[in-house]
């Protein structure tokens, strides 16, 4: 049985040419996460593998980073990147976790940033 | 044309190291991680490790761990590795292969280095 | 670690028969399979990732399907360049298991 929950950032936004953290966080749980994959809309962006590390799309390269934990970081934001983003969770013996952000890129400079959780 | 053009062929001693190369052209060589795969005669495909040429981190197969070690030059595009303290089963075909855009999967392959280990 | 079985090991076929190779995994693998074709003395070609998804330059009579641990390569028609051997892989976890491989030979 499924019995964990993630939390996201929620509704989020950010100015065009900055940078924003993408982060998920499951809970309620003991399942092994094995995999994490970040995807926009079909778009793989990365994955992270608890036992290979980080695969960063190569399209993506330049403007995404790993981290932070099993966050990602996108930087050089544009009006483009506005968007759903998933986090998958690949959990043993659970199963698949998603959980949905959605990013909004402004190109004012008053970017008012939707409520945040701190991971310990 | 993406191409990954890997040394010739070693005749090594048991207890010595090789190292192979492996040049990559037609592509970004810090975009993509690198992996490293191996072929006994007649035998099965076994992942040894993985790098990354833009961080030169690196992962590798547990079994390998303690003799394996991968490096990048990145002014010539050019993948190592190098495998320590060789013995008869490690007589192979070794292959560099491009990791895929979407996964821990190889996209392109070189022609494979024969290193043959021999008293 | 997570094990990939092939069957057959070996299949004998004619151009043109419909051929179907079967891989299994040892627990659930989602869709993380890729299958290769190598021909002898060279290096494995890229058929399929993410268990259905045709590489670039693949002809159409490839295809792939199976998700969890059941996962098939299925050659439509066969031609007489698609007799080598064929692998399939686990492409993400460690040690990135292949599994021992299907020879196809002509009848």
């Known amino acids: 049985m499924m019995t964990g929950t993630i939390e996201t950032t929620g509704n989020i936004s950010a100015e065009k040419g900055g940078s924003i953290i993408l982060q998920c966080h499951l809970s309620s749980t003991t399942a092994q996460v094995t995999q994490v994959n970040w995807e926009q809309q079909d778009q793989l962006l990365a994955i992270c593998n608890a036992d290979l590390g980080w695969h960063i799309s190569p399209s993506f390269k330049d403007r995404v980073a790993p981290g932070p934990g099993l966050g990602l970081t996108l930087q050089s934001l544009t009006v483009n990147d506005t968007g759903e983003y998933f986090c998958i969770y690949h959990t043993y013996p659970d199963g698949t976790y998603t959980g949905r952000i959605f990013l909004e890129v402004l190109e004012s400079s008053v970017a008012e940033h939707g409520a945040r959780f701190q991971i310990p | 044309e993406v191409q990954l053009v890997q040394s010739g062929a070693e005749v090594k001693k048991p207890g010595a190291s090789v190292k192979v190369s492996c040049k990559a052209s037609g592509y970004t060589f810090t975009n993509y991680w690198m992996h490293w795969v191996r072929q006994a005669p007649g035998q099965g495909l076994e992942w040894i490790g993985r790098i990354d040429p833009d961080s030169t981190g690196s992962k590798y197969n547990e079994k390998f761990k303690t003799r394996v070690t991968m490096t990048v030059d990145t002014s010539t595009s050019t993948a190592y590795m190098e495998l320590s303290s060789l013995r008869s089963e490690d007589t192979a075909v070794y292959y560099c292969?491009?990791?895929?855009?979407?996964?821990?999967?190889?996209?392109?392959w070189g022609q494979g280095t024969l290193v043959t280990v021999s008293s | 670690d997570i094990q990939m079985t092939q069957s057959p090991s070996s299949l004998s076929a004619s151009v043109g028969d419909r051929v179907t190779i079967t891989c299994r995994a040892s627990?659930?693998?989602?869709?993380?399979l890729a299958w290769y074709q190598q021909k002898p003395g060279k290096a494995p070609k890229l058929l399929i990732y993410?268990?259905?998804t045709l590489a670039e330059g693949v002809p159409s009579r490839f295809s792939g399907s199976g998700s969890g641990t059941d996962f098939t390569l299925t050659i439509s028609s066969l031609q007489p360049e698609d007799f080598a051997t064929y692998y399939c892989q686990y492409h993400s976890g460690s040690p990135l298991p292949f599994g021992g491989g299907t020879k196809v030979e002509i009848k």
């Open positions: 292969a491009r990791e895929g855009a979407y996964g821990y999967y190889f996209d392109y």
């Open positions: 627990e659930n693998i989602y869709s993380y």
């Open positions: 993410n268990a259905r």
